[in-house]
């Protein structure tokens, strides 16, 4: 797997240990927690990052209204089970044999059950809505400048193909970034929208996952864009299955 050969580090994932003991004596970087080798030329999957984190020695008309089926990650951190490709396994269980089904970004999409719970497939999250509120500024940002800067950020920093940034909405002080990526649209080598959103979320929180890079310095026409709160909504290709009890 590609890693910075000269000093054997992983530019895209600081939660790794790198050693020149890969194939052909090349630099190989392993994710903390799982020990899986990661490709340092692209983003590491959210599942491996969560696992590493758990093992490491925290309304207006122009804005999109999240659908009734949109999920918010209320459960917080957990130590996930990842498949051989580093993706979330459809069924997750904790130490006390409580199990639940997750989507492709690892967010719970069913009620919790026991070990008999079945999760037949990993349901893909095909639409992510990132809802940001920025700190007060002298005036509103120019919408097209803001749009261009956020698209550039996802393209250059997170290596997400521009076609997957569906829209950027803005009504001061709320910014919404829509990411869309159907199973059929995602080609081999494409960054997953869930991984890009997770890297962005950590950047916004000042917890950058990139090695040695400074934190995220977002500017629109030289004006700093400082985010004071973030909410992320996840929409799955198949709606989640919660009991009515949870919805009331």
């Amino acid at each position: 797997h590609t890693a910075a050969q000269d000093n054997c580090t992983c530019p895209t994932n600081k939660m790794t240990v790198c050693s020149p003991d890969g194939p052909g004596g090349r630099c190989q970087c392993r994710a903390l927690g799982s020990g899986m080798a990661v490709d340092c030329s692209t983003l590491t999957s959210k599942c491996l990052l969560l696992k590493a984190r758990m093992s490491a020695p925290k309304n207006a008309r122009t804005l999109v209204r999240p659908s009734e089926h949109a999920l918010v990650d209320n459960d917080g951190l957990y130590d996930p089970d990842c498949d051989p490709e580093g993706r979330f396994k459809a069924r997750q269980c904790n130490q006390t044999s409580v199990c639940w089904c997750v989507n492709s970004v690892g967010v719970r999409r069913t009620d919790k059950g026991d070990l008999s719970l079945r999760c037949d497939e990993l349901v893909r999250t095909h639409h992510i809505l990132i809802d940001l509120r920025h700190r007060p500024t002298a005036g509103a940002f120019n919408h097209s400048d803001l749009d261009a800067e956020l698209r550039r950020l996802f393209r250059e920093r997170y290596r997400l193909h521009p076609k997957f940034v569906a829209a950027v909405h803005y009504e001061q002080p709320t910014i919404q970034i829509e990411l869309r990526q159907n199973t059929s649209q995602k080609a081999a080598g494409d960054v997953d929208i869930g991984d890009a959103a997770y890297y962005f979320e950590r950047d916004i929180k000042g917890e950058s996952l990139f090695q040695g890079r400074g934190g995220l310095d977002l500017r629109v026409r030289g004006e700093p864009l400082q985010v004071e709160r973030t909410l992320i909504y996840y929409l799955d290709e198949i709606p989640p299955k919660f009991s009515m009890k949870r919805l009331t």
Partner: antibody, heavy 115, light 107 residues
Framework: QVQLQQPGAELVRPGASVRLSCKSS????????INWVKQRPGQGLEWIGN????????NYNQKFRDKATLTVDKSSSTAYLQLSSPTSDDSAVYYC????????WGQGTALTVSS | DILLTQSPAILSVSPGERVSFSCRAS??????IHWYQQRTNGSPRLLIS???ESISGIPSRFSGSGSGTDFTLIINSVESEDIADYYC?????????FGSGTKLEVK
Amino acid sequence: QVQLQQPGAELVRPGASVRLSCKSSGYTFTSYWINWVKQRPGQGLEWIGNIFPSHSYTNYNQKFRDKATLTVDKSSSTAYLQLSSPTSDDSAVYYCTRGSGFDYWGQGTALTVSS
Amino acid sequence: DILLTQSPAILSVSPGERVSFSCRASQNIGTSIHWYQQRTNGSPRLLISYASESISGIPSRFSGSGSGTDFTLIINSVESEDIADYYCQHSYSWPFTFGSGTKLEVK
């Protein structure tokens, strides 16, 4: 040339903690994983765990999590395997080895737990 | 944990014969498999790394192949000094595990 040096044998009383050593030379000690492997007489090889010397990051086989503790002394390029409360089940040869494909091995330390 | 199954447990061949050792992983591990030889009372030594990479100082009669879940170690023309136990080991993820080994006997 790369070498991993281990004492040939150790004798320990049951219940008394023991620390096995593995001194590395001939390469940059802090750049490669050190693994520990157990082999009981006439049996196969079992991976105990590993340690990355530059920042002492460790991983353990669940089976050995309460038995083994891995540490390093960077100043002497030495890795250590400490076994707590040894019993006769811990009598075995313990090897230290380097990397992910274990390209260099120590000679092994034959640990005998006996009163 | 990833389980490695080696077969057969014992192989008995005549000098000069070609012999193959099998190692099967319980899940896809790419090419993260390594092969070792351990002679009686000796330390294991690395024969093949990452499924097929040859190791300096190891005779060219040793070769490896496979990817995913099925791997093979081949000795092209067995010599008497090859009498030993042979182990596969994966380095795909932690914990690393070894196969149970195959004992090579020469008739």
